[in-house]
Interface confidence: medium
Amino acid sequence: MASAGMQILGVVLTLLGWVNGLVSCALPMWKVTAFIGNSIVVAQVVWEGLWMSCVVQSTGQMQCKVYDSLLALPQDLQAARALCVIALLVALFGLLVYLAGAKCTTCVEEKDSKARLVLTSGIVFVISGVLTLIPVCWTAHAIIRDFYNPLVAEAQKRELGASLYLGWAASGLLLLGGGLLCCTCPSGGSQGPSHYMARYSTSAPAISRGPSEYPTKNYV
């Protein structure tokens, strides 16, 4: 029963991670620019995402513009887009694999095969978590590098947007959930059903570490 609980917890975490990842990819808040005047904040904030950029006025009005040409976009933005979409699709595939092998489904009857499918889904979720982490970390690295680069003019300096934090959360949840699903499965590949059941009844929850924490900093 403990393993079933871990499985459910694992899949819930991965589902939360997937939703977070979807929101992170969709929201135009990867990079944020707060235009600062000499002593006052100018009433304009620019949000930049993977698909569009938005200008938010102090009145609350927001104007968004979808990026026109795919080919005209910077390569790192194209790569981030691709990785985001791939990560979401990989996680969906992981979910399908999990459903095929879940304890409560009858797609696969043999317990050992089910265990292997759950393990596979866990690995797929971990891969999805890593794929989510890459564009988020890459973008954050570029933002921080430019922020501290004395050759970069102020208009080109950016801050970390909410989408990046959502992306880190998504990656963490996918890695954690995937890790839990991997931990609920037997280590051997071809043991009989009796070993499988014994392993399940005695398995203790693995201590799973979340993603490494990023130092938070006030940039403005």
């Epitope: 000499n38 100018v42 680069n149 004395p150 050759l151 970069v152």
Partner: antibody, heavy 120, light 107 residues
Framework: EVQLVQSGAEVKKPGESLRISCKTS????????MHWVRQMPGKSLEWMGG????????HYNQKFQGHVTISVDKSISTAYLQWSSLKASDTAMYYC?????????????WGAGTLVTVSS | DIQMTQSPSSLSASVGDRVTITCQAS??????LAWYQQKPGKVPKLLIS???SLETGVPSRFSGSGSGKDYTFTISSLQPEDIATYYC?????????FGGGTKVEIK
């Protein structure tokens, strides 16, 4: 006393290569980024690009990207501007100027300039 | 790129006159503006940064004002040693760009 001493005037033919220098003294070299500014005869000033002497990162004006190379030798506190193939349109006065590392991007001190003449 | 339009391109005034030079950016530069003086055959010298802040050692007859896209440089009482070309420069956005310059002469 802060000094940005530039190399002497150069007369070159189109297609030739050239490297001009800007030797600095009187301040901590790594506390300022070094930049090059072009002034064509009778014209205004144009920022060409700059370099961070701490990590050798460069930032170019797109107009000059690929045509010139900016470099530094930290050991002798000197900045360089280099062309691999000069054109007649490169005839101008070239100034090196510094920008405070932790400040805004304006030039607080300039070299005396190097006149480059490219003529066949 | 941000275009800096400086006017007039040249002016002639008498000693003691008030001289005003304007600089207009093609977009808002959020007070990230510097003014330089270049005397004939000499190197540019920084006079003002942040649109209004006078650099150390610069005479108080020089001043700067403005915001948004429009900025003004003023010499309250023109002196013979002020004969020079004056340039504005924006440092809000890369590439850093200069105005076309204003040549100031004595009548």
């Amino acid at each position: 006393e802060v000094q940005l001493v530039q190399s002497g005037a150069e007369v070159k033919k189109p297609g030739e290569s050239l490297r001009i220098s800007c030797k600095t003294s009187g301040y901590t070299f790594t506390e300022y980024t070094m930049h090059w500014v072009r002034q064509m005869p009778g014209k205004s000033l144009e920022w060409m690009g700059g370099i961070d002497p701490n990590n050798f990162n460069t930032h170019y004006n797109q107009k000059f990207q690929g045509h010139v190379t900016i470099s530094v030798d930290k050991s002798i506190s000197t900045a360089y501007l280099q062309w691999s193939s000069l054109k007649a349109s490169d005839t101008a006065m070239y100034y090196c100027a510094r920008i405070y590392y932790f400040g805004r991007l304006y030039f607080d001190f300039w070299g005396a300039g190097t006149l480059v003449t490219v003529s066949s | 790129d941000i275009q800096m339009t400086q006017s007039p391109s040249s002016l002639s005034a008498s000693v003691g006159d008030r001289v005003t030079i304007t600089c207009q950016a093609s977009e808002d530069i959020y007070n990230r503006l510097a003014w330089y003086q270049q005397k004939p055959g000499k190197v540019p010298k920084l006079l003002i940064s942040g649109a209004t802040s006078l650099e150390t050692g610069v005479p108080s007859r020089f001043s700067g004002s403005g915001s948004g896209k429009d900025y003004t440089f003023t010499i309250s009482s023109l002196q013979p040693e002020d004969i020079a070309t004056y340039y504005c420069q924006q440092y809000w956005s890369a590439p850093l760009t200069f105005g076309g310059g204003t040549k100031v002469e004595i009548k």
